[in-house]
Interface confidence: low
């Protein structure tokens, strides 16, 4: 049976086997087409989600679709039901928490009272007073908290207590990529991890340990990517994996937070990378133990210079490393998180590509997660 499962796929009605390599090849080889059903699926970027959260204390903002203007949500008459609606609009299904925070001196959006209409947040029709002088600070999910804070050093062995959201994404029991838990159902990773194998069946996720292969594997229900853009082949290197069964969170299995839409990280901002990737650029071997390293944001202009990536780094990407080189992600780290710590840990980047590993002028290039929030929310909403 193991051999059969490894090399063949069973079609139903009538029952017969086809070679597994015919799965997800774009041809309907089973009469009912089930060989093309459980494949990596593409999902368009979709419409603008009309709610978002700002890095200013996770305050809620609402889009007025008529004018295209964003407004800050006033705390007046804001209810649990409105909080749930806001989070559902972003695709969350967990119970949110919210509180009032004072309008700050840098408030640059108009503040309006919020109401609900057809399960979407709307601005109240009148001119929107905000007598409380407070905004809504909203958290859709408890995320980004770990049991242990990493020490700031170069590269060292990591503990799952520090990075409980890190997962190993495996095909046929082999580690292929890293990934991050975003909520009980969803793992974030890179789209290029699935270029070779587009059938969902053989992909598994392992969570809750810092050692490769020492923890149970989780079945995957769906793998979703953005439509491939041949004009920018390195763009859109992001994927979401939906687990067959929701994770139970614990000290070693927890979600990381998505970034805020306005999370603009300036050059030299300290960040962290983790992975089981190759420890030497040419060959070497996969690390059995999770490794962590502190890096920093590298200016895109510097990253696109003539002696570096010569314009290949787009606005939907970011560079990170250390100016003198030597600390970088490598093969096998792909799909893992580039992380920033404010009050919580946020996944600001996804390990994507680079020339070599750890070169001084060619740092790691990461998918900028904030550029894809809208896509993530639309995928989650479609799957709610």
């Amino acid at each position: 049976k193991v051999i059969l499962d490894k090399y063949y796929f069973l079609c139903g009605q009538p029952l017969h086997f086809i070679p597994r390599k015919q799965l997800c090849d774009g041809e309907l080889d089973c009469p009912l087409g089930e060989d093309e059903e459980h494949c990596v699926k593409s999902f368009p970027e979709g419409p603008a989600v009309a709610v978002r959260l700002s890095k200013d204390r996770s305050t809620l903002q609402v889009l007025d679709s008529a004018t295209g203007n964003w407004f800050s949500a006033c705390f007046d008459n804001f209810t649990e039901a409105l909080a749930e609606t806001a989070c559902r609009q972003m695709g969350y299904s967990s119970k949110p928490t919210f509180r009032a925070v004072e309008i700050g001196p840098d408030q640059d959006l108009d503040v309006v009272e919020i109401t609900e209409n057809s399960q979407e947040l709307r601005m109240r029709n009148s001119s929107g007073p905000c007598l409380s002088g407070s905004l809504v600070s909203l958290h859709c999910l408890a995320c980004g908290k770990s049991l242990k804070t990493p020490r700031v050093v170069g590269v060292e062995e990591a503990s799952v207590d520090s990075w409980p959201w890190q997962v190993s994404i495996q095909y046929d029991k082999q580690h292929v990529c890293g990934g991050s838990i975003l909520d009980p159902h969803w793992v974030l990773t890179a789209a290029h991890c699935f270029r070779k194998h587009t059938d969902v069946f053989n992909w598994k996720v392992r969570a809750g340990s810092d050692k490769l292969g020492s923890f149970p594997s989780l079945a995957v229900a769906k793998i979703i990517i953005i439509e491939f853009n041949p004009m920018y082949p390195k763009d859109n290197d992001i994927a979401l994996m939906k687990l067959q069964f929701p994770l139970t969170f614990s000290g070693t299995v927890r979600p990381i937070c998505l970034p805020f839409f306005d999370e603009e990280l300036t050059p030299a901002t300290p960040l962290w990378i983790i992975g089981w990737g190759f420890t030497k650029q040419n060959g070497g071997k996969m690390s059995d133990i999770l490794l962590q390293a502190s890096v920093q944001v590298i200016d895109s202009t510097r990253c696109n210079a003539d002696d570096a990536y010569q314009g290949e780094v787009t606005e939907k990407m970011m560079c990170a490393g250390i100016p003198e080189g030597g600390v970088d992600t490598c093969q096998g780290d792909s799909g893992g998180p580039l992380m920033y710590q404010s009050d919580q840990w946020h996944v600001v980047g996804i390990v994507s590509w680079g020339y070599g590993c750890g070169g001084p002028s060619t740092p790691g290039v990461y998918t900028k997660v904030s550029a894809y929030l809208n896509w993530i929310y639309n995928v989650w909403k479609a799957e709610l």
């Epitope: 408030q107 007073p129 007598l131 002088g133």
Partner: antibody, heavy 122, light 107 residues
Framework: QVQLVQSGAEVKKPGASVKVSCKAS????????MHWVRQAPGQGLEWMGR????????NYAQKFQGRVTMTRDTSTSTVYMELSSLRSEDTAVYYC???????????????WGQGTLVTVSS | DIQMTQSPSSLSASVGDRVTITCQAS??????LNWYQQKPGKAPKLLIY???SLQSGVPSRFSGSGSGTDFTLTISSLQPEDFATYYC?????????FGPGTKVDIK
């Protein structure tokens, strides 16, 4: 400290126009809506309208629509209220008043300008 | 437009008295109500916002209560500097409207 200083008293003939200024200081001018309220002698307070100093967007009370124009000059942190086709019943003290909280349209007015008396008389 | 009414229109009181002024809105305005004090020849001054929140710098003898359509301003112990006219104002919707005022003078 936050201060609103208005222009001096005016005497106008019926049918003329008056333009009252209100110079703001001590805070980020573009962040706070400014409203205009008037008070006829011995009478109560009457709201005329508001302006968003950042965008210049205005909203006027129906009663003054077509006769009032509110503008701002961000370079001098000044808002203006111009009332045209004056009649004797427009004789009043005109106040500019800033909203209490930044970014909010009207959560109570604080502070107020000292007021400008406009007398309309033939 | 939302109509605001105040009562009484005037009252005479002595220093140390407890004074209560009421304000009624023609429709439900939740807690979108502010109270102002105005002295002759001066601009109004914000005392209470959001029906019951005391504006900073305002003495604690002033308090506000109410929600919906009925609101109250209370001065727990009248001081000489409190003789003035008091206005309520709704900011629930545009146009902003004020009550006609309550004049508090010395008995």
């Amino acid at each position: 400290q936050v201060q609103l200083v208005q222009s001096g008293a005016e005497v106008k003939k019926p049918g003329a126009s008056v333009k009252v200024s209100c110079k703001a200081s001590g805070y980020t001018f573009i962040g706070y809506y400014m409203h205009w309220v008037r008070q006829a002698p011995g009478q109560g307070l009457e709201w005329m309208g508001r302006i968003n100093p950042n965008s210049g967007e205005t909203n006027y009370a129906q009663k003054f629509q077509g006769r009032v124009t509110m503008t701002r000059d961000t370079s001098t942190s000044t808002v203006y209220m111009e009332l045209s086709s004056l009649r004797s019943e427009d004789t009043a003290v005109y106040y500019c008043a800033r909203v209490r909280v930044r970014g909010v349209i009207h959560p109570g007015f604080d502070p107020w300008g000292q007021g400008t008396l406009v007398t309309v008389s033939s | 437009d939302i109509q605001m009414t105040q009562s009484p229109s005037s009252l005479s009181a002595s220093v140390g008295d407890r004074v209560t002024i009421t304000c009624q809105a023609s429709q439900d305005i939740s807690n979108y109500l502010n109270w102002y004090q105005q002295k002759p020849g001066k601009a109004p001054k914000l005392l209470i916002y959001a029906a019951s929140s005391l504006q900073s710098g305002v003495p604690s003898r002033f308090s506000g209560s109410g929600s919906g359509t009925d609101f109250t301003l209370t001065i727990s112990s009248l001081q000489p500097e409190d003789f003035a006219t008091y206005y309520c104002q709704q900011s629930y919707s545009t146009p902003v409207t004020f009550g006609p005022g309550t004049k508090v003078d010395i008995k």
